[in-house]
């Protein structure tokens, strides 16, 4: 997260980290006791999922292995359209004040809405500084028309843009798959942006979750 600050303790109890061994790979969100939602470009063969603490490496955190993951069938490694994936935990997460399910959206929020993006990704770019504490930054949803002015034909209709004009506030490497939460509901998953991260007027691009709620629910049901 570029130009952000540590999240208020316990304010993101649905936030998870996907680890490869002990190394941060991506962010994600807890959908229910068995399922984590993240970005399709975060796919690995096996995951260790960190839940229940804002601090990576916290021994009080839950760590659950996951071996099965289901990319959206329409995901493209060229355009990165449909960049979302469900990861099935090998054992159930224990819900608590620090481990809660995210609220999936019932509607798409409009441009101008203030949202929070969070993650343990690098806070500097191109040199990297990985924080141990979960970082947050507020950004505003940007209309597809305005975002297309920047990204032209790279932007697909299930992609959502967010940023602050003339500001560095953005996501970065390591934040992928993590949540963009607006008015208490999950509206986006960190997908991509320009490099180095935090270039003013280059919005972050997110998978627009409100377009995929049916696929999310159907996939969890199918692979119960």
């Amino acid at each position: 997260i570029i130009d952000g600050a540590p999240c208020a303790r316990g304010s993101h109890p649905w936030q998870v980290a996907l680890l490869s061994g002990n190394q941060l790979h991506c962010g994600g969100v807890l959908v229910n006791e068995r399922w984590v939602l993240t970005a399709a470009h975060c796919k690995m063969n096996e995951y260790t999922v960190h839940l229940g603490s804002d601090t990576l490496g916290d021994r009080r955190a839950q760590r659950i292995k996951a071996s099965k993951s289901f990319r959206h069938p329409g995901y493209s490694t060229q355009t990165h359209v449909n960049d979302l994936m469900l990861v099935k935990l090998n054992s159930q997460a224990r819900l608590s004040s620090m481990v809660k399910k995210v609220r999936l959206p019932s509607r798409c929020e409009p441009p101008g809405t203030t949202c929070t993006v969070s993650g343990w990704g690098t806070t500097t770019s191109p040199d990297v500084t990985f924080p141990s504490d979960l970082m947050c930054v507020d950004v505003k949803l940007i209309s597809p028309q305005d975002c297309t002015k920047v990204y032209k034909d790279l932007l697909e209709n299930s992609m959502l843009c967010a940023g602050i004009p003339d500001s560095k506030k953005n996501a970065c490497n390591g934040d992928s798959g993590g949540p963009l939460v607006c008015r208490g509901t999950l509206q986006g998953l960190v997908s991509w942006g320009t490099f180095p991260c935090g270039q003013p007027n280059d919005p972050g691009v997110y998978t627009q979750v409100c377009k995929f709620t049916k696929w999310i629910n159907d996939t969890m049901k199918k692979h119960r």
């Epitope: 970005a39 060229q78 990165h80 040199d127 990297v128 790279l154 490497n173 992928s176 942006g193 320009t194």
Partner: antibody
Framework: QLQLQESGPGLVKPSETLSLTCTVS??????????WVWIRQPPGKGLEWIGS???????YYSPSLKSRVTISVDTSKNQFSLKLSSVTAADTAVYYC???????????????????WGQGTTVTVSS | DIQMTQSPSSLSASVGDRVTITCRAS??????LNWYQQKPGKAPKLLIY???SLQSGVPSRFSGSGSGTDFTLTISSLQPEDFATYYC??????????FGGGTKVEIK
């Protein structure tokens, strides 16, 4: 600004291992989120990608060379290196090291262009 | 593997000419294409990244366009220092990274 410099023997015997080092100055190989790349160019021919290594020390190799190539990083010396085993005359080329600048973050971090290059070092395979 | 085909392989042009070089990918590569200039005995130099973005310090007479499978490098008004070999390069999600065969721009 960032500079890259290749070093290693200019002459290698057939069946031996070619070893080259790229020294990075003006920047840190251990703290920058770039790819570090080896490319070669046989005499009078085009450019051929050999392989790359990223910030996380993940390696990516050309399928045609994969069985013979090892790329590694020595962060204490700010260097990365190339080893190519069982060389033949077909491995005679100018070898370049380069920095791969990602075209984006997240899903677009896997794509890159080489924005800084070493001047190249000529390696001849001959007995 | 994705093959990159450049055309023409060589061309002769005069100072001030508009020069166009094309690069075709064997399958769609979105906009993940870069262009390089190489002068004899020198390392390549990045000119254009992401199909159309001009690398810092490169003169504005160079431009790139295209997406999917067909890409173009244009030099709007050829200068004496532009006589060189030009390569396109695709940056894949899965290796290998591949270059086109090169286009040599010579003085007419």
């Amino acid at each position: 600004q960032l500079q890259l410099q290749e070093s290693g023997p200019g002459l290698v015997k057939p069946s031996e291992t070619l070893s080259l080092t790229c020294t990075v100055s003006g920047g840190s190989i251990s703290s920058d989120d770039y790819y570090w790349v080896w490319i070669r160019q046989p005499p009078g021919k085009g450019l051929e990608w050999i392989g790359s290594i990223d910030y996380y020390a993940s390696t990516y190799y050309s399928p045609s060379l994969k069985s013979r190539v090892t790329i590694s990083v020595d962060t204490s010396k700010n260097q990365f290196s190339l080893k190519l085993s069982s060389v033949t005359a077909a491995d005679t080329a100018v070898y370049y090291c380069a920095r791969g600048r990602p075209l984006g973050y997240g899903a677009k971090h896997y794509y890159y262009g080489m924005d800084v290059w070493g001047q190249g070092t000529t390696v001849t395979v001959s007995s | 593997d994705i093959q990159m085909t450049q055309s023409p392989s060589s061309l002769s042009a005069s100072v001030g000419d508009r020069v166009t070089i094309t690069c075709r990918a064997s399958q769609s590569i979105s906009s993940y294409l870069n262009w390089y200039q190489q002068k004899p005995g020198k390392a390549p130099k990045l000119l254009i990244y992401s199909a159309s973005s001009l690398q810092s310090g490169v003169p504005s007479r160079f431009s790139g366009s295209g997406s999917g499978t067909d890409f173009t490098l244009t030099i709007s008004s050829l200068q004496p220092e532009d006589f060189a070999t030009y390569y396109c390069q695709q940056s894949p999600y899965f290796p290998p990274l591949t270059f086109g065969g090169g286009t040599k721009v010579e003085i007419k």
